[in-house]
């Protein structure tokens, strides 16, 4: 069964401060007012949930206070930012979108964004 289409960039490079941003866009087959967005990380064959937010169309995404994710929404686009990334967090980050309300329920899963994180070199001590 053809799932709801979700598009996300193939590759993103995190900033030197360990911040990565990407857009997750979905083709809504319905008239959803409540949408759930989940970021999953796939490493080898293991899948873990990075963060999740439910939002009402036209409103802001609300992640939990201790979440490493923030985001904004505009129509069928979600701008996601993941913070506090380190080199060991390099991996495939998958955007999952669920249209929760009103029914019918739809689910779509992106192909994933490969996020590369390079730890910054420590600054050498400087003598003045």
């Amino acid at each position: 069964c053809k799932a709801m289409h979700v598009a996300q960039p193939a590759v993103v490079l995190a900033s030197s401060r360990g911040i990565a941003s990407f857009v997750c866009e979905y083709a809504s087959p319905g008239k959803a007012t409540e949408v759930r967005v989940t970021v999953l990380r796939q490493a080898d064959s293991q899948v873990t949930e990075v963060c999740a937010a439910t939002y009402m169309m036209g409103n802001e995404l609300t992640f939990l206070d201790d979440s490493i994710c923030t985001g904004t929404s505009s129509g069928n686009q979600v701008n996601l930012t993941i913070q506090g990334l380190r080199a060991m967090d390099t991996g495939l980050y998958i955007c999952k979108v669920e249209l929760m309300y009103p029914p019918p329920y739809y689910l779509g899963i992106g192909n994933g964004t490969q996020i590369y994180v390079i730890d910054p070199e420590p600054c050498p001590d400087s003598d003045f």
Partner: antibody, heavy 116, light 106 residues
Framework: EVQLQPSGPVLVKPGASVKISCKAS????????IHWVKQSHGKSLEWIGY????????DYNQKFKSKATLTVDNSSTTAYMELRSLTSEDSAVYYC?????????WGQGTAVTVSS | DILMTQSPASLSASVGETVTITCGAS??????LNWYQRKQGKSPQLLIY???NLADGMSSRFSGSGLGRQYYLKISSLHPDDVATYFC????????FGGGTKLEIK
């Protein structure tokens, strides 16, 4: 109240075709896909495919692509499934169900028996 | 197609007990999984959608969990009315069902 009313049980001969129906009521017909599911005796469920009344688009399980044809009549809010070149392997209960990516209401099922 | 393997095939438990049914996918399905309940002589009913969401009208004694390849349906405080066959369903690609778990009361 959402209802999916199937056509009655049918007995058909091998090699023949049959068209079964599913009359939907109690909701906006074009808002939901109509899925069809096969339940063979003593076996698990098999998804056959869906048709989306809003656009007329459909998608099939590859296994049933040459066996089943799904159609809808929006004016009568009825979905149809035609099964062709029937064999004893096609004897089963066939359910229609509405949904997007979850089938939240199911009809009672139509029993199709293929026998000479 | 993605193969869904359900276990156990049958299960007998006492009223008030908690039981768990497992569903394994042959590849990652990222929570794209539904659970259905089919009582004897009735049509299947949606129980859990999207791995964790309880369908309207279903008892909160039912809960779903899992991510990746392994999924679980937990039934707490078992009732006689829970006697049924439970099916998991993958909703990625070609939809496929598990073989079913028949739950009986001791």
């Amino acid at each position: 109240e959402v209802q999916l009313q199937p056509s009655g049980p049918v007995l058909v001969k091998p090699g023949a075709s049959v068209k079964i129906s599913c009359k939907a009521s109690g909701y906006t017909f074009t808002d939901y896909k109509i899925h069809w599911v096969k339940q063979s005796h003593g076996k698990s469920l098999e998804w056959i495919g869906y048709i989306y009344p809003y656009s007329g688009s459909s998608d099939y399980n590859q296994k049933f692509k040459s066996k089943a044809t799904l159609t809808v009549d929006n004016s009568s809010t009825t979905a149809y499934m035609e099964l062709r070149s029937l064999t004893s392997e096609d004897s089963a209960v066939y359910y229609c169900a509405r949904g997007g990516d979850a089938m939240d209401y199911w009809g009672q099922g139509t029993a199709v028996t293929v026998s000479s | 197609d993605i193969l869904m393997t359900q276990s156990p095939a049958s299960l007998s438990a006492s009223v008030g007990e908690t039981v768990t049914i497992t569903c394994g996918a042959s590849e990652n399905i990222y929570g794209a999984l539904n659970w259905y309940q089919r009582k004897q002589g009735k049509s299947p009913q949606l129980l859990i959608y999207g791995a964790t969401n309880l369908a309207d009208g279903m008892s909160s004694r039912f809960s779903g969990s899992g991510l990746g390849r392994q999924y679980y349906l937990k039934i707490s405080s078992l009732h006689p009315d829970d006697v049924a066959t439970y099916f998991c369903q993958n909703i990625l690609g070609t939809w496929t069902f598990g073989g079913g778990t028949k739950l009986e009361i001791k």
